[in-house]
Structure formats: C-alpha cells, structure tokens
C-alpha cells in the first residue's frame, strides 16, 4: 500500500559503535522524503529526522536513554511537497527496522593504549577508557562505566625481535605483565564482551612498542 509515486524504505540497517547509533536505509529519495520514528517495546514512538532527504538518521540521543532496552525504528515515506498524503490504509508507507538492543549489539570501538610503564621486569599497560555518549547525572559515561565487568580487554604482546605472541586478560583497564629484562616489547589490545553472541570483539588497537613515546621506563 502507500502513496502514488512513493516507495517504501528498505535495507534498514543499524550502524552503532560505542553507542553512537545511526539508522541507514535505501533508496536515495526521488520526489519523496522520509521521517524516522523510534520506540522501545512501550510503543511510544518518537519522531526524528523529519521530512529528510537523507538516508540516515542519528538515533543516539534516543538509545542512550536506556541502552539495555530493545528498540525498533521505522522509516516513513512521503511524497515531496505533500507530506500529509497517506496510503490506502490511512497511514503513510513505512518499513520497520530490525530490533536493536544497544547494550548487546553496539560495536566495540577500536581501543587505544594510553600508556605503558616498565618497572624492572614488570610492565603496566593502561587502556584508554573511552567516553561514550551515554549520560548519567549529566555526565558522559565511559565504556567501563557502562559495561562494568562485562567488558574485558585482551592484551597481545611480543618481543620486538620475535613474532611469538603472548596474551593477558583484564576486567579493568590495566595489565601488569612480566617481561624479560633488556628486551623491547610491542603491545596491542582488544576489547571483548565474552557474554555476547554477536559483536563480541573490537578490532585490535594500533600497535605500540617500547622505546617509543608512550612508554616510561624505570630500571630498578
């Protein structure tokens, strides 16, 4: 059903990283515009991106209100210049998105090694606790604030002179590892939510190696 010369949106896709969440769809509009609505299971639909010719809509402000809720969005199609027009069922043509639960599905962004510090044969590696757009009491929460102990980091480390990698895990943002004295090491970290069934792991962080700027070395 729908309006003359109006086509329904299709390929509605959620693109979400660290809770920054955008709904994308097709097609590029020809003589039509779109409005997006989003709702939890309450059915209290909120309109966003009114009468837009874009094929994406930033829904971050809505989903960060409760990242553990499951959301559905729908994209309405209207003839350009005649947005009051409706279909044969008395409603404008629309299509629903897949369900989306931010806490379970948002992609984990690429982490960053904030610093590493060597004290004798120990190295402390710190992962930057990235800020998200999730707010509590008017302050933005970090990834750790949101996920708590559900979030772990895996550290991959290896001697600069060899390719054999070792791993360590932490449910904080810090690692304390043993290293061989006098050897330089390289590090990369990955964020992981083991309890997830999808989007469990981030991409690996950029590699950081001892002897470069981020490190601090203290021989004991």
């Amino acid at each position: 059903s729908g309006t003359t010369n109006t086509v329904a949106a299709y390929n509605l896709t959620w693109k979400s990283t660290n809770f920054k969440t955008i709904l994308e769809w097709e097609p590029k509009p020809v003589n039509q515009v779109y409005t997006v609505q989003i709702s939890t299971k309450s059915g209290d639909w909120k309109s966003k991106c009114f009468y837009t010719t874009d094929t994406e809509c930033d829904l971050t402000d809505e989903i960060v209100k409760d990242v553990k809720q499951t959301y559905l969005a729908r994209v309405f199609s209207y003839p350009a210049g005649n947005v009051e027009s409706t279909g044969s069922a008395g409603e404008p043509l629309y299509e629903n998105s897949p369900e989306f639960t931010p806490y379970l599905e948002t992609n984990l962004g690429q982490p960053t090694i904030q610093s590493f510090e060597q004290v004798g044969t120990k190295v402390n590696v710190t992962v930057e606790d990235e800020r998200t757009l999730v707010r509590r009491n008017n302050t933005f929460l970090s990834l750790r604030d949101v996920f708590g102990k559900d979030l772990i980091y895996t550290l991959y480390y290896w001697k600069s002179s060899s390719s054999g990698k070792k791993t360590a895990k932490t449910n904080t943002n810090e690692f304390l590892i043993d290293v061989d004295k006098g050897e330089n090491y390289c590090f990369s970290v990955q964020a992981v939510i083991p309890s997830r069934t999808v989007n469990r792991k981030s991409t690996d962080s950029p590699v950081e190696c001892m002897g470069q700027e981020k490190g601090e070395f203290r021989e004991i």
Partner: antibody, heavy 118, light 108 residues
C-alpha cells in the same frame, strides 16, 4: 512469569456499559504497549484497541471508535477498557494482550465474556 | 484494509506428520506477520513473530517463513498437543491489525 487476568465482564443490555480490567504481573508493565482483542462465539480473532506504555497514544478499530475507551494505570499495573453504547455484535470473549511496540501479541490473558442481549 | 487469507481452513493430520499452513496477504506486508495457536476455550498463544522469529518457550518444531504476501507456518513433526486452531496476523498496516480466519488442525 507473565500473567494477565481480565475481570469485569458479564451480561449487559444493548446500549449499556461495562468496564473491563486486566491486572498484569511478571513484567514491567509501563515498558509495554497493551491491547484488547476479542473473539465472538465460534468466530476468529478481532483486534479492538491498543495503548502505548505511557498511555499517551491510543488506537481503536473502526467498529468501536467513539464507543470504547482504552486506558491504563501504570501505578496499579492495570489495563482498562470502558465500553459504552454496547451492541449485540460486541458479544465476545475479550482478551487483554501484552503488545511489544504495539505490533504483535506475545502474551494473552485467559479472556472474559461480555454478552450483550436484551 | 489488508485482508489475510489462510489455507486450508481445516486440516486433518496424524502425530508425527509434517504440517504446513499458509497465510496470504492482500498486499505486501514485508515480514510483519505473527502466528498464534489457540485451543478450545483457551487464550491464544504466540508462536512466531516477524514471520520467522520463534517466540520464547515455543518448541523448535514450529517454524515460520515468508515475506511480502505469502507466509508459511510449519510444524515439523506433529505432537498430540499441537491439535488446535492457528491464526496469522499482519502488523504492517499498523495500527490496523488484521487476523486470518484461522486453520483448524484436527487429528486424522
């Protein structure tokens, strides 16, 4: 466990009124849209009315518009259907149903009979 | 309004049979279709939503498929407790929901 328990049905004369209630438990009531669906004797299912979780948005089938009013009290976890100007064709078992997004009916009450007859 | 037509209206089958019930929409409804089971004097029970998503707690012998106008509910191996009436429901023309007329599944 989700439970929905309807009450308030009975026999009423044409033109009369009834108020159905549906007591909900086992889920966060305000987080879900709710609906009323009816089934006339030996007939199929017929959607009557729906309401969003906040109670702000309501919907009605054309056959009951202007006669029935859906409402909810989230502090009491209860859904209501006020039925006025009842007609013989409103005779049915009325079910309340939990309705994610206001779209489909994932849990149903056991139903309550409303009989409109002189 | 969108009309939903189920076929067959009634069906006789035996325990262990594979059973298929179809539902056709009078116009495209994407995948916005649900299936329900109802036993005599009981409330309907949700089986499938979004055409193919199994409702929590529903046995895996039930499955749904289809998109657009043609949809199928399949019971892979009929059990004694599956004899009931089955309804499809579209929710594409929200909020004007419509149900199919029902398919009564009886013991052969």
């Amino acid at each position: 466990e989700v439970q929905l328990l309807e009450s308030g049905g009975g026999l009423v004369q044409p033109g009369g009124s009834l108020r159905l209630s549906c007591a909900a438990s086992g889920f966060t009531f305000s987080n879900y849209a709710m609906s009323w669906v009816r089934q006339a004797p030996a007939k199929g299912l017929d959607w009557v009315s729906g309401i969003s979780g906040s109670g702000v948005t309501t919907y009605y089938a054309d056959s009951v518009k202007g006669r029935f009013t859906i409402s909810r009290d989230n502090s009491k976890d209860t859904l209501y259907l006020q039925m006025n100007s009842l007609r013989a064709e409103d005779t049915a078992v009325y079910f309340c149903a939990k309705t994610p997004w206001g779209y489909y009916f994932d849990y149903w009450g056991q139903g309550i009979l409303v009989a409109v007859s002189s | 309004d969108i009309q939903m037509t189920q076929s067959p209206s009634s069906l006789s089958a035996s325990v262990g049979d594979r059973v298929t019930i179809t539902c056709r929409a009078s116009q495209g409804i994407s995948s916005w279709l649900a299936w329900y089971q109802q036993k005599p004097e009981k409330a309907p029970k949700s089986l499938i939503y979004a055409a193919s998503s199994l409702q929590s707690g529903v046995p895996s012998r039930f499955s749904g498929s289809g998109s657009g106008t043609d949809f199928t509910l399949t019971i892979s191996s009929l059990q004694p407790e599956d004899f009931a009436t089955y309804y499809c429901q579209q929710y594409n023309s929200y909020p004007l929901y419509t149900f199919g007329q029902g398919t009564k599944l009886e013991i052969k």
